[in-house]
Interface confidence: low
């Protein structure tokens, strides 16, 4: 019995459209395939960025896959051609592995890149990064940010910065459409006429990152003698109701601070009838439900009742 | 704009196949899927399946799988939809509609191409 | 497969009114926090329209009148105030999984 062999796939690359971190791996079929015409020969690839103790593993028919990547960092990936046992007659047969590496090789010290990158999507709606120039960069020095996600035709710069001193050091981005729920890749360069400036590469998912405005209408009702219904709204905007987690502050007569995280937009509190003052305010935020990770909204406005009947009387802001 | 421009109407024979094309512009067409759907002749929508435009990989609606083939041409930005073994109930107009992702809906559909299947 | 159920299938409403429409899918069309739900309006010889994709998220351009919501198995689409130009066939349609599918269709009609 001769020993069945294969090739590993050629022309194996990992190409960069220029999309800030979303990276095309692609390769071309193994040489003498000709033995295996009736046979649909599959690719196990794999991919990691260097220094990441765990690969990536795909296996696939096609002759390209895509993912993100950390361009802070560089990228190695192996490939090998794998023909199923029904192809041999016995057991699967692998080829040698081809590999391939990409980086970009980076310019000016570490130093140099922006500080303290911090990123916002208000209210599902508005995207706000903001950030400090790189330690000991002079006042020539200016950052430029691109971004890029899955709908753009190419990464754009940012059009309405943020400045202090002649510096950009944020941006206001305008509406995203579609962006949620996929990858969002952003660089962040600089030019300077004294030194290079090290590039610096962020990618999160807006729904992640979302902080949403406070609730609003916070009112009063007396259910029972001893009972009494904290309510409030969810906040105009694209936000639904099922996507929020709230906490209450609740101050009675000053001395007790009750605190409560709930995801109904109501609340009862067991009181007495001796309570003279009862305050409470609420913030928002978005649930596991909807996304893996959030920031608190501020505080709503401060809504109290002060020595009155809670049963004749129920406040609206 | 996005637009999808779809081949014109055919009238084909029982047992024949039909290749209806669609061709997109206005947009990155290597980013999104195109789907295939039909609607019979005062019926509802019935999906037939869809194609990454990118590396070319198909997903089919069972009831579709022996007879529908999808094709891509990334360099005309064209997706082709070939329908074989065609009978009466084949009678429909077929849409090509543009989707990012499985929760971004179809967002852009071409004008529709009526098939006829008639003897 | 996953199988849509609209109703009502058929409407008469008058302009200004609050239409309500429903839709029922035979398993949870939930994942990952979202509901892969979509609604679209279709007029007679004319392809469908993109309203609602994810349950409650507008398709760009649609007028604020058109809403989304539910989430699971049980979905409603509101026209807040029907105008002239909203008289059209409505689907909904599930793309959690391969077949996606269509509900029969909603007729929204003059009283």
């Known amino acids: 019995d001769t020993e069945i062999k294969v090739n590993p796939p050629q022309d194996f690359e990992i190409v960069d459209p220029g999309y800030l971190g979303y990276l095309y791996l692609q390769w071309q079929p193994p040489l003498s395939l000709d033995h295996f015409k009736e046979c649909t020969v599959e690719y196990e690839l794999k991919y990691r960025n260097i220094g990441s103790e765990t690969w990536k593993t795909i296996i696939t028919k096609n002759l390209h896959y895509k993912d993100g990547f950390d361009l802070n960092k560089g990228i190695e990936a192996k490939i090998h051609t794998l023909l199923p046992w029904q192809c041999t007659n016995g057991s699967e047969v692998q080829s040698s592995w081809a590999e391939t590496t990409y980086w970009i090789s980076p310019q000016g010290i570490p130093e140099t890149k922006v500080q303290d990158m911090d990123c916002v999507y208000y209210n599902w709606q508005y995207l706000l990064c903001s950030w400090k120039p790189g330690i000991g960069v002079l006042l020539d020095t200016n950052y430029n940010l691109f971004y890029w996600y899955e709908g753009l035709d190419h990464a754009l710069q940012c059009v309405d910065y943020i400045k202090a001193d002649g510096q950009n050091i944020g941006c206001r981005f305008p509406y995203l459409e579609a962006s949620d729920y996929k990858d969002f890749y952003i660089c962040v360069n600089g030019s300077s006429e004294n030194k290079p400036i090290r590039s610096s590469y962020f990618t999160f998912q807006l729904q992640n990152i979302v902080k949403p405005l406070p609730p609003v209408y916070l009112t009063f009702t007396r259910e029972s003698s001893c009972e009494i219904k904290l309510k409030w709204s969810i906040p105009l905007g694209p936000i639904p109701a099922r996507c929020f987690d709230y906490e209450i502050e609740i101050r009675e007569d000053d001395t007790t601070l009750v605190t409560a995280t709930v995801e109904n937009e109501t609340y009862t509190l067991k009181t007495t009838n001796e309570t003279r003052q009862l305050c409470f305010v609420v913030r928002s935020k978005v649930n596991i439900y909807c996304s893996d990770d959030g920031i608190w909204s501020e505080w709503s406005d401060k809504q109290c009742w002060e020595g009155e009947d809670l049963s004749k009387k129920t406040l609206l802001r | 704009q996005v637009q999808l421009v779809q081949s014109g109407a055919e009238v084909v024979k029982p047992g024949a196949s039909v290749k209806l094309s669609c061709k997109a512009s206005?947009?990155?067409?290597?980013?999104?899927?195109m789907n295939w759907v039909k609607q019979a002749p005062g019926q509802g929508l019935e999906w037939i399946g869809r194609?990454?435009?990118?590396?070319?990989?198909?997903h089919y609606n069972q009831k579709f799988k022996d007879r529908a083939t999808l094709t891509v041409d990334k360099s005309t930005s064209t997706v082709y939809m070939e329908l074989s073994s065609l009978r009466s109930e084949d009678t429909a107009v077929y849409y090509c509609?543009?989707?990012?992702?499985?929760?971004?809906?179809?967002?852009?559909w071409g004008q529709g191409t009526l098939v006829t299947v008639s003897s | 497969d996953i199988q849509m159920t609209q109703s009502p299938s058929s409407l008469s409403a008058s302009v200004g009114d609050r239409v309500t429409i429903t839709c029922r899918a035979s398993?949870?069309?939930?994942?990952?926090?979202?509901?892969?739900m979509n609604w679209f309006q279709q007029k007679p010889g004319k392809a469908p329209k993109l309203l609602i994709y994810?349950?409650?998220r507008q398709g760009s351009g649609d007028p604020s009148r058109f809403s989304g919501s539910g989430s699971g198995t049980d979905f409603t689409l509101t026209i807040s105030s029907l105008q002239p130009e909203d008289f059209a066939t409505y689907f909904c349609q599930q793309s959690k999984e391969v077949p996606w599918t269509f509900g029969q269709g909603t007729k929204v009609e003059i009283k």
């Open positions: 398993e949870s069309v939930d994942n990952y926090g979202i509901s892969f």
């Open positions: 194609i990454d435009a990118y590396a070319g990989e198909t």
């Open positions: 994810a349950a409650s």
């Open positions: 206005g947009y990155t067409f290597t980013n999104y899927w």
């Open positions: 509609a543009r989707g990012y992702g499985d929760a971004y809906g179809m967002d852009h």
